[in-house]
Interface confidence: low
């Protein structure tokens, strides 16, 4: 960042999107600002318009190509600049030498579905979205289950330390409504972070058979 009150954070989704957030204390809300991306080894550059997300922060997505195209590699460097209009000229407000595969945040897992449900257990699968083939199997997942009367924040985290796109939830209560979420993270990258949580999948366990112990 250009000064101490500015924060410029970006993540690469491993395929064709860099998402950026810029926050600046005392910045004018009506100033027009953009993020400019200049790769060191590619014959393209890209710009996105920063849009306000709060009083002093702006966000935008650099769309580098079609969603599943592999636009950057582990040795790419992308110079990212925040440029804000000052009258007839543009002023650089922040700059960073962005290493895409050191700053990864994948898309949330998709296509969650119940494979099999019983009274006390439920098998759920999902798919990863727009994840680079470079990762091979070097991914991990976190999952959580929302029980009645609890919040997501209270839900214990289950960790899957390998690329496993399913889970078998055990010790569930019969005839009970649950929700399930999962997120993914590559093992690569110093500043890599978890993907957003998936859309919740609602499911209900089967009722216990009448006359039987549960």
């Amino acid at each position: 960042a250009v000064n101490g009150t500015s924060r410029f954070t970006c993540f690469y989704n491993s395929r064709a999107n860099i998402s950026c957030v810029w926050s600046q204390d005392g910045a004018l809300q009506d100033t027009s600002c953009q993020v400019h991306a200049w790769p060191d080894r590619r014959r393209w550059n890209q710009t996105c318009e920063l849009l306000p997300v709060s009083q002093a922060s702006w966000a935008c997505n650099l769309i580098l190509g079609t969603p599943d195209s592999q636009k950057l590699t582990a040795v790419d460097i992308v110079t990212l600049r925040v440029m804000c209009r000052e009258g007839v000229r543009w002023r650089m407000m922040a700059i960073q030498d962005f290493k895409p595969f050191e700053n990864l945040r994948l898309m949330a897992p998709i296509s969650l579905q119940v494979v099999h449900v019983e009274t006390h257990r439920c098998n759920i699968s999902w798919k990863i979205s727009q994840a680079s083939h470079y990762f091979e199997r070097h991914l991990e997942f976190e999952a959580r289950t929302l029980s009645p009367g609890h919040t997501w924040e209270e839900a214990p985290l289950m960790t899957l330390k390998q690329k496993q796109e399913w889970i078998c939830l055990e010790t569930l209560t019969p005839d009970t409504q649950y929700e399930f979420q999962v997120r993914v993270k590559p093992l690569q990258g110093e500043f890599t972070t978890w993907s957003p949580w998936s859309q919740p999948l609602a499911f209900r366990t089967k009722p216990a058979a009448l006359g039987k112990d549960t």
Epitope: D40, R42, R43, A74, V75, T79, I95, Q96, D97
Partner: antibody, heavy 119, light 106 residues
Framework: EVQLLESGGGLVQPGGSLRLSCAAS????????VHWVRQAPGKGLEWLGV???????DYNAAFISRLTISKDNSKNTVYFQMNSLRAEDTAVYYC?????????????WGQGTLVTVSS | DIQMTQSPSSLSASVGDRVTITCQAS?????LYWYQQRPGKAPRLLIY???NLASGVPSRFSGSGSGTSYTFTISSLQPEDIATYYC?????????FGQGTKVEIK
Amino acid sequence: EVQLLESGGGLVQPGGSLRLSCAASGFTVTSYAVHWVRQAPGKGLEWLGVIWSGGSTDYNAAFISRLTISKDNSKNTVYFQMNSLRAEDTAVYYCARAGDANYDGFAYWGQGTLVTVSS
Amino acid sequence: DIQMTQSPSSLSASVGDRVTITCQASQSVSFLYWYQQRPGKAPRLLIYDTSNLASGVPSRFSGSGSGTSYTFTISSLQPEDIATYYCQQWSTYPLTFGQGTKVEIK
């Protein structure tokens, strides 16, 4: 016209340090990365490191403990400092820049500056 | 590090001859470059991204290849082509060069 001009070469004692400058003209070092490559007498080319337009660096791991690349944007100049020099560091040192498409290989080179490490 | 091995290490050919230099990478590379270096001079970029001719470079120079195997060709050798030629990869750090091929006129 893009130009790179190295300076600071000469005779250095073993165990000493060298500080080279690469003065850029025709472009700004806030817009382009500058690389350093060396060539020992009668030998091939060896990439040493790079300083990116935003100021971060990448080094050849073989030199990372004794190499520092920095720059002064106001002077449009890149600096190369190497410590603990030994005879095998005797070489012509070049700074280089990629082409106008921001990545076209090393399209621009300085003339090189000779560093001799000897007692 | 990726090793780049050029062959031959030197060659002698007549003016007008077709000259071919190969560059073998120790692992697959995506971006390959060729440079010409005349004695006492800085290298000059000839070919970028495997097969693209750099600005101002005569069309008798060409490049091809993929993966681990690349080729550089001078279709009709000229006296001013006397130089050492280097390949270079830019797929993984550190960037590495071949050991060079010295081209001489018979």
